[in-house]
Amino acid sequence: LDARQFLIYNEDHKRCVDALSAISVQTATCNPEAESQKFRWVSDSQIMSVAFKLCLGVPSKTDWASVTLYACDSKSEYQKWECKNDTLFGIKGTELYFNYGNRQEKNIKLYKGSGLWSRWKVYGTTDDLCSRGYEAMYSLLGNANGAVCAFPFKFENKWYADCTSAGRSDGWLWCGTTTDYDKDKLFGFCPLHFEGSERLWNKDPLTGILYQINSKSALTWHQARASCKQQNADLLSVTEIHEQMYLTGLTSSLSSGLWIGLNSLSVRSGWQWAGGSPFRYLNWLPGSPSSEPGKSCVSLNPGKNAKWENLECVQKLGYICKKGNNTLNPFIIPSASDVPTGCPNQWWPYAGHCYRIHREEKKIQKYALQACRKEGGDLASIHSIEEFDFIFSQLGYEPNDELWIGLNDIKIQMYFEWSDGTPVTFTKWLPGEPSHENNRQEDCVVMKGKDGYWADRACEQPLGYICKMVSQSHAVVPEGADKGCRKGWKRHGFYCYLIGSTLSTFTDANHTCTNEKAYLTTVEDRYEQAFLTSLVGLRPEKYFWTGLSDVQNKGTFRWTVDEQVQFTHWNADMPGRKAGCVAMKTGVAGGLWDVLSCEEKAKFVCKHWAEGVTRPPEPTT
């Protein structure tokens, strides 16, 4: 089965929907090979029979109306379906359900009853039909301004449910962007791999990175990003001066703005690149970024020397996609296995380095840097979310702190670098930052505020600072670091934590923790999340189980211990309609939560109260 296709299964009858003809939609023993049983979403609310390239619909919104197949019409109210609670499936905006088995009727009918015979799943899963939801495919080039492919579409009186090369000599795959190409003549190429599709991209000969300039399209920022992602790419990020110069040349003949990946869509943080590249190079148009609310997305202006301007994300523009090795210098971020034996007194170890906050004696940035270097280190450079979360959660960082780190643009204006010379691989700006205020003299960077995010600051301001040095193998672990915890467990706040040593299913991991007189970890707030991210994020394993799942009640996530879910840290598109158990990711998306099948094997984190901690009283109900 193509990933978009599925069989519509009723668990009670143990049968699947079978389209025998356009006027007869019945059920049969499930057979994943049978074309007549394959269906797929072709819009947010329409389901198409793969065999007939026609859509499921009804003649009227009435009880006991027959469900049959019709020419797909995105405007028809009689072809709009929706998933309701608990695998119920029916016509949109009604309480009439897709039903089989009542009154000895062989055909699928609309029925007002919401019993087991009106409940449908994707065959072979526990998921409702909407879990295989429609994903719009944005066309490229052509004459339709990047519009979405309309499946099925008619060409030379034949219906196509997929991209086709029909009518072309070059084999390029295309789609109609209305249901009737013969009438409307609107088309675009499909964002798929086919012979010659590399011609859709421009390759920078210096870096090998590929760029796609979609100047004829007119999409919102989010649509543009979806289009790039469909091609295993992302909206453009610019981290190097050379890259900006290459793009200036590439776009010089164009006049209209093009979406790039820069945005301030995260409420808690500042400017960031979609895809996670560090925001370290600034190329704003004079007067930008505008502080007007809602202008959270950024376009590159070819006519204005390819400088950047922030706009409302719903504007429709062309866009630039980027794929291939990132422009970041090759740099090995230490993994957790490189953790040293320890650090000098008052310094804290993490992944091969030692860290210390100095807040007693405030210094201007230059003198703070000198002080760190005198101790054998440098102002702290931060290369990953894990390292950031370690500093934030384990160094004694305080919400009212404002501390120098090593990032600055002293050498080249608008191009931030670390004072220790390591490459910039990560940034975490506060909202509205970097602002380059005070006559553009904010050349140094501080970590500040309750989240420890960053802001640029005038370097002459006396502040506390964070030093970092390479660890010395003979040094000692800070005293009392894991007080109240058994050997091998790590202390944070009132709790002890252990990383499970074996790959286990969710159930087995839960048993292991119980045997250790602990439980699969809960996450109560962002401080605990930051600690856990720093604990597991750099490890080579892909996932670590937490105690969260919706196995007891699909759609309602609960911890294995009866604690309220008060904090979440979902990855993009999670939990969606997925059912299962929740694990923390490592790597680029370090610490973010994904829903996995509970039978998958992953490492895990156990948690229990530390010895000597006075527990709060149990809440009374």
Epitope: L141, G142, N143, F155, G167, R168, S169, D170, G171, W172, W174, Y181, K185, F187, F189, E195, G196, R199, L200
Partner: nanobody
Framework: QVQLQESGGGLVQPGGSLRLSCAAS????????IGWYRQAPGKQRELVAT???????NYADSVKGRFSISRDNAKNTVYLQMNSLKPEDTAVYYC?????????????WGQGTQVTVSS
């Protein structure tokens, strides 16, 4: 824009040969592939042969082993060598170019050249 000019058509006896030429001009760098199509009276236009930018070729089953498509990059010309011609090959032969900037699915067409196979 791409302009296409066909030549080389004519009257030939069954079993004979002809070589058609298609000269391309204009924005030739945008061309992905050039194909030959034909249309006999009262019939649908059908694909005969194609050659892509990378040099891969493709033929209709009815002409495999008899027709051969080739190109001369220096002259921006594509050729269709037609051997062992049959009366059913009689048609107007059209040259077609597909580019990545096509504003309709079919791309660009030449005016066509008539090929008649008759004794």
């Amino acid at each position: 824009q791409v302009q296409l000019q066909e030549s080389g058509g004519g009257l030939v006896q069954p079993g004979g040969s002809l070589r058609l030429s298609c000269a391309a001009s204009g924005n030739i760098f945008s061309i992905n592939a050039i194909g030959w199509y034909r249309q006999a009276p009262g019939k649908q236009r059908e694909l005969v042969a194609t050659i892509t930018l990378s040099g891969s070729t493709n033929y209709a089953d009815s002409v495999k082993g008899r027709f051969s498509i080739s190109r001369d990059n220096a002259k921006n010309t594509v050729y269709l060598q037609m051997n062992s011609l049959k009366p059913e090959d009689t048609a107007v032969y059209y040259c077609n170019a597909n580019t990545y900037s096509d504003s309709d699915v079919y791309g660009y067409w030449g005016q066509g050249t008539q090929v008649t196979v008759s004794s």
